[in-house]
Every structure is written in structure tokens, then in C-alpha cells.
């Protein structure tokens, strides 16, 4: 069977640029989603964000985030998600396991899911960028 090559070394600055792009796109997505009035966030949904037992950028739960955003894309035709997915794929290893998401069926609950996950994704990218920049500062001190 096919084996992957040595894991490519990327300058941390390049990874930071990917996360900066994701942070910007997450804000665009949230702004778009928030235009829907009368929808409240739900406590029933949690987007995995950072793993405490890995170093940046491998601490970002990119495969799970991708699965959640792909679900939103299927529920609501947000084209910005296509670009988000392309950038998340820059952080996901080809051998990463798949994540299954249970999708709400009720229309209003779908809207709550979309708002909640979009909000958490935006917050997650803020945290991811902080973890990257603080990690880079620690590496230079």
C-alpha cells in the first residue's frame, strides 16, 4: 500500500498565514449567519477546537472542524465555506480519521446549529491564532 512521504516541514509563519486566513473567513461566515434574526445559540452543540496534548498547529482539531463546516454547507448554501474547507485541508493530514456529525432535522434547530457552530468556529480561530503566536514567542525566548 502507498506510504506517505516524510511530513513536510513548513515555516511556522506559513501555518500562521493559513490560520489568519481562516480567522478572517470565519468572521465573514459569522457575519453572514448573524443576519438571520431571531435565532439563538444552543448549548447542545460543541465544536472541537484545540487539543491540549499537541503542539501548534497540530493542536487544531481541523478534521472535526471541517466535518462540522461541511455539514453547515449542506444545510445552508454558504459559499465562503468552500474556501474555509480548502484552507482547513492545508492543516489536515491525509490519514486523519473521519468525523461523523449528527445533523438536526428541524428547520429552526438547523438554524441554531449553524449559528452556534459558526460562532464557536470564529472563537476557535481566534484561540488557534493566539496559540500559534504564543508558541512562536516561546520558541524564540
Amino acid at each position: 500500500s502507498h506510504t506517505l512521504p516524510v511530513r513536510l516541514l513548513r515555516p511556522s509563519d506559513d501555518v500562521q498565514k493559513i490560520v489568519e486566513e481562516l480567522q478572517s473567513l470565519s468572521k465573514m461566515l459569522l457575519k453572514d449567519v448573524e443576519e438571520e434574526k431571531g435565532v439563538l445559540v444552543s448549548q447542545n452543540y460543541t465544536l472541537p477546537c484545540l487539543s491540549p496534548d499537541a503542539q501548534p498547529p497540530n493542536n487544531i482539531h481541523s478534521p472535526a472542524i471541517r466535518a462540522y463546516l461541511k455539514t453547515i454547507r449542506q444545510l445552508d448554501n454558504k459559499s465562503v465555506i468552500d474556501e474555509i474547507i480548502e484552507h482547513l485541508d492545508k492543516l489536515i493530514f491525509q490519514d486523519a480519521p473521519e468525523t461523523n456529525i449528527s445533523v438536526p432535522t428541524d428547520t429552526h434547530e438547523c438554524k441554531r446549529f449553524i449559528l452556534t457552530i459558526s460562532q464557536q468556529f470564529s472563537e476557535c480561530m481566534d484561540l488557534a491564532l493566539k496559540s500559534l503566536t504564543s508558541g512562536a514567542q516561546q520558541a524564540t525566548t
Partner: antibody, heavy 122, light 107 residues
Amino acid sequence: QVQLVQSGAEVKKPGSSVKVSCKASGYTRTRYWMQWVRQAPGQGLEWMGAIYPGEGDTRYSQKFKGRVTITADKSTSTAYMELSSLRSEDTAVYYCAFPEGPYAAPYGMHYWGQGTTVTVSS
Amino acid sequence: AIQMTQSPSSLSASVGDRVTITCRASRNIHNYLAWYQQKPGKVPKLLIYYAKTSASGVPSRFSGSRSGTDYTLTISSLQPEDVATYYCQHFWKTPWTFGGGTKVEIK
């Protein structure tokens, strides 16, 4: 040994459609993007679109949107590119290609099919 | 869409010469660039990926570098077998456009 084998040459009438296949072997990953590229006689490489075979997620060049459909059959590890409303300027060699990794997003396309010549003529 | 402007479109150099081909991206693509070699009637072959990483089996005379949004493919000592057309392609976001190509010939 990773291999991409494409279907054979086609001669088509203007206005008809063509469907080119690309079968991958020796590759076990599903998290990757495969691309389709074409090259008209004496011209450069032109990106048409891409597919994420694991999910059937697609991206298309604006130039071909509405005329091209890229699909994949996971069970046979085969990708397909269908181009409709053919015209003489679609006469070209069509290639499929995909990356080695290690990430789901490509850095470059390591593996290429042998190319499929499509001739559009009345 | 991100535009890739490749120059020159053709060049002629002597065996042993140092040859450089440049691709300029219309926006920052953060090293997500590949270089391919295509010989007449043949399939494109990956030379360089991630701007400066050599693909397996590529001779050491081929190298890639970056300065801002300018990406360069250098052939340190041109050989007769290097006669081909060279293309760049970016992978920052779709569409993954190609440069127009550079045809390299021997004087």
C-alpha cells in the same frame, strides 16, 4: 506503485458530450483533491476543476462552470470528467492528476494520467 | 481568481548556462506553488512543490525560490535533456491557475 489510467481517445460531434475516466491504483487515501487539466494543441495547461473523492466535493473553473461535471466512484477508485456542449475549441488532451501528500490540500500534483485526446469535429 | 504571470514565454540558452524562470502571483500564495516540466508529446512532470521542495528523482540542478509574490525556477547548468516547456501552478485557493508556460531551447 501509484498509477492513474485514463480512458481512450474520443472523437465527438459539436454539441455532444464526452465523459473521460481516470482510475487510480496503489493509493489508499481518501483525503486528497484530484484535479482535471486540459491542453489544447500547441497551448499551455488549463485548470478545469477538482474533486475531493472521499465526499464528492467539487470545485470548477469559472470558464467551464455549467459545462463540466466532475464525479468520483469511491468503490472503483475512479474519477470522471464530463464536458457537455462540445465545440471545436474543446479539442485537447485532458489529464487527471493528484498529489502525494502529506496534507489533504495539494502542494503540487505528483501523479498524472497518461492523457485522453478528445477531438471535436463535424 | 489569482493570476500567475510567467516570464519569459520562451528562452534560448547554451548547455551549461544558468537559466531562471519567474512566476508572479497576483496576490500572496504563501509558498503554495509547484513547477512542472513538460517535454513535447509527454505528460507534465512535477519538479518542485511547496515553492522550493524537490520532487523525488528530480536532478539537483533544478531549484525553486521565492521573493514575496515572485517565485523562481532555476536550472543551475542547462542540459540538452532540459529542453521542454515549464509551468508554474498555485494551490492557495481554487481555481488553481497555471502560468502561461516557458519554452526552453538550446542555442
